[in-house]
């Protein structure tokens, strides 16, 4: 009996009946055993088949078998109801070996030519299975020449049997206060040969509650308790289970903050598994009662560990813990069932006593001393000498705890001194220098510091003067002795002021003419305004209409009089403004250099002389009455003139203040 080729030789070839293509003889038996490499099978088909036909192929036949299984018994030329001829069929071994047996009996009624067949080894596709058969692999099957291998979906690992996919279902830790967990693939069948461990781990103080939901189907056994697949639940104090079968287990109140759930499956079965919904509870905290004028958020039926609430106060009320203010308040429930902070109060906002207003007063409108939310106060300035700047002085205690004006300002109003008030009324004509009376020139300032000079009060902490009068003291402001509120130069009764800083116009050059002869002195304290101390107004844009040629201005000071001495009493003179060209011409002649009179100057005086300001008056104000506002304003600053004061054909020259309004405003706003 020929064996045929064996692996590792190439496995393919031809088989034929004895004597083929001639007729085969009687009483023949021939057997071929073909062997392919592992993972391969043998394919066989006939190119010629002509054997004696007999019932069930009892006489002559070709039998194909693989292992113990007969694949086919063949005879005849064509198949009948009870006999089979190969025709165009291809035959496959079940494993890697194929046995072919040819037999002829003792006689043939006519000659038969036998058979010719060809065979070859081919790869077995182990991944293809017949319907109803178990799949080769659990998840993915991969065929290759001579064999196959299995692989698994993400979340699974190949079991050591190389076919089953075990779930990678351990190490999951649930830390939320509630959640769901289930068997792998639920509600589809759970995987075989798996061991799953799930942990629920909550903060100390919580107790886990387990509820089995939807369906429960774990392989069971009628007599033995869960021998195949089972679910176990373990806490630090007890074990629950094992569970299997089709009945939903009851709720489990673990009284523990940590739970381990173990699920083990064997290699067989087709069950859908389980699903658990877990919640947690803890010792509840006392129900938070909102303080008066406050509310709790969020509102819950109960508050347990880690739950929190906040307190929000009504508008006009604020969170206070005793005397200490809080912007927000949140309390958290602790594991022992107590809140981590005590309840604060919602106290009505108290803006507190309003600040004192310099040169003003405050009046309680709502009620004496009432300073709580929505209370109203009224600020006002001392009448006659002060006026309120910008707002109306009405302030309300707002919810943020600040007194707030109707314009939303939280700063105090400002009481600004009223400027340009004088006890004096102007006469219609010019007459000689006269003694000033109390309140005539309340802006008049006496400046002592090496020489005698003058200035005019602006606001309540600035003095306007001539640059040449304070030039020597520009770096030593504290050396200036500033006096106001007096008529007598030598009187001990005056208001003393001291200089904080001296600002000389940057365009002024000492000993080189008097252009830009203007300076400001900042006082180190505000002075109190009264009938004897009142600031002069700065000129309005329209002021030029009150300072035309021949309009009358008034100069005042303690400068030299006709007798050649400094005046003891404050003197004043009413003098007309002189045409600018006329004045310029008067100072073109020697000894005056050309261009002495500039556009920054104005001139005043009589052509006939006799009325003038003089040495000692320097820095003082030449003032004019604004007939529209009925306030006096400074038009000029006593600057220079002829060597002989009051000389005919010569005039007093004054710094033209209106040209310097931006400079004055900038200095005052910056400093």
């Amino acid at each position: 009996t020929p064996l045929g080729p064996k692996w590792p030789e190439p496995v393919f070839g031809r088989l034929a009946s004895p004597g083929f293509p001639g007729e085969y003889a009687n009483d023949q038996e021939r057997r071929w055993t073909l062997t392919a490499p592992p993972g391969y099978r043998l394919r066989l088909y006939f190119t010629h088949f002509d054997l004696e036909l007999s019932h069930l192929c009892e006489y002559d036949f070709v039998k194909l078998s693989s292992g113990a299984k007969v694949l086919a018994t063949l005879c005849g030329q064509e198949s009948t109801d009870t006999e089979r001829a190969p025709g165009k069929d291809t035959f496959y071994s079940l494993g890697s070996s194929l046995d072919i047996t040819f037999r002829s009996d003792y006689s043939n009624e006519k000659p038969f030519t036998g058979f010719e067949a060809f065979y070859a080894a081919e790869d077995i596709d182990e991944c293809q299975v017949a319907p109803g058969e178990a799949p080769t692999c659990d998840h993915h099957c991969h065929n290759h020449l001579g064999g196959f291998y299995c692989s698994c979906r993400a979340g699974y690992v190949l079991h050591r049997n190389k076919r089953t996919c075990s779930a990678l279902c351990s190490g999951q830790v649930f830390t939320q206060r509630s959640g769901e967990l289930s068997s792998p693939e639920y509600p589809r069948p759970y995987p075989k040969l798996s061991s799953c461990t799930y942990s629920i781990s909550l903060e100390e103080g919580f107790s886990v509650i387990l509820d089995f939901v939807e369906s429960f189907d774990v392989e069971t056994h009628p007599e033995t308790l869960c021998p195949y697949d089972f679910l176990k639940i373990q806490t630090d104090r007890e074990e629950h289970g094992p569970f299997c079968g089709k009945t939903l287990p009851h709720r489990i109140e673990t009284k523990s903050n940590t739970v381990t759930i173990t699920f083990v499956t064997d290699e067989s079965g087709d069950h859908t598994g389980w699903k658990i919904h877990y919640t947690s509870t803890a010792q509840p905290c006392p129900y938070p009662m909102a303080p008066p004028n406050g509310h709790v958020s969020p509102v819950q039926a109960k508050y347990i560990l880690k739950d929190s609430f906040s307190i929000f106060c009504e508008t006009g009320y604020e969170l206070l813990q005793g005397h200490l203010p809080l912007k927000s308040f949140t309390a958290v429930c602790q594991k022992d069932g107590s809140w981590d902070r005590p309840m604060p109060a919602c106290s009505i906002v108290d803006c507190g006593p309003p600040d004192d207003l310099p040169s003003g007063r405050v009046e309680y409108i709502t009620g004496p001393g009432v300073t709580t939310y929505k209370a109203v106060i009224q600020y006002s300035c001392e009448e006659t000498f002060y006026t309120m700047k910008v707002n109306d002085g009405k302030y309300v205690c707002e919810a943020d705890g600040f007194w707030t004006s109707s314009k939303g300002e939280k700063s105090l109003p400002v009481c600004e001194p009223v400027c340009g008030l004088s006890a004096r009324t102007t006469g219609g004509r010019i007459y000689g220098g006269q003694k000033a009376k109390p309140g005539d020139f309340p802006w008049q300032v006496l400046i002592l510091g090496g020489t005698t000079a003058a200035g005019a009060l602006l606001y309540d902490n600035w003095v306007l003067t001539a640059a040449h009068a304070v030039y020597e003291q520009k770096h030593d402001a504290s050396a200036l002795d500033i006096r106001m509120g007096t008529l007598k130069r030598l009187s001990p009764h005056y208001t003393q002021a001291w200089s904080e800083a001296v600002f000389i116009h940057e365009g002024y050059t000492h000993d080189a003419g008097f252009d830009n002869d203007i300076a400001l002195i900042k006082l180190n304290n505000k002075v109190v305004i009264n009938s004897n101390i009142t600031p002069i107004c700065l000129p309005r844009k329209e002021a030029e209409s009150f300072m035309r040629t021949d309009d009358i201005g008034t100069a005042s000071g303690w400068g030299l009089t006709q007798r050649g001495f400094l005046a003891r009493n404050l003197m004043y003179v009413d003098i007309p403004i002189v045409d600018h060209q006329k004045c310029t011409a008067a100072y073109e002649k020697p000894p005056y250099p050309r261009g002495s009179v500039t556009a920054n100057m104005l001139c005043a005086g009589l052509e006939s002389g006799g009325k003038d300001s003089c040495r000692g008056d320097s820095g003082g104000a030449l003032v004019f009455l604004d007939s529209e506002t009925e306030r006096w304003f400074v038009g000029g600053i006593v600057s220079w003139g002829s060597m002989n004061c009051g000389e005919a054909g010569q005039y007093g020259v004054y710094t033209k203040v209106i040209n310097y309004i931006p400079w004055i405003e900038n200095i005052i706003s910056d400093f």
Partner: antibody
Amino acid sequence: DVQLQESGPGLVKPSQSLSLTCTVTGYSITSDYAWNWIRQFPGNKLEWMGYISYSGRTSYNPSLKSRISITRDTSKNQFFLQLNSVTTEDTATYYCAVLYALDYWGQGTSVTVSS
Amino acid sequence: DIVMTQSQKFMSTSVGDRVSVTCKASQNVDTNVAWYQQKPGQSPKALIYSASYRYSGVPDRFTGSGSGTDFTLTISDVQSEDLAEYFCQQYNSNPLTFGSGTKLEIK
């Protein structure tokens, strides 16, 4: 971590003003709470001077009200103490602190009032 | 002003002992009381607020109790590092006031 740090001159002349700065790191002074000045006299007696709250409102010890001012600079997360017309009685260690639920103190700065 | 009286200027105790420091307010301060520990050369450190609430990081051997006018700080198992001066403070009303302090000495 919340930290408070006091700074300012260690020596002040009588009748002058004492000015101290508290610099806060790790928490915004506008977020919440009251930001306090507390002083400890030789002998360890503690005195609360006043606070400025998260909103900028102030509360002062009435015994100091005429000469104390507490202000702040939110852009620098600092608050300040100014105590006017000091005398030798104001010699102490000065602390800035946030009190109540958040409680942190600076390390303190020693101030001597002496001519 | 509310006066906070710590009647005992000094208290002597041994390691492992239980000791109570008391503080009395001159008028009702509800539970708006804090306790501070101050070690030599250091700034005060808060232990308790709202009479009985312990700050995080404070050992649980420190407990506070009381309301209204009478307050107590108890150290249940005195350790050598508890050698310090202890101050109570009320923050119920303006001005906030402190007790004069109780110095704890370890025998």
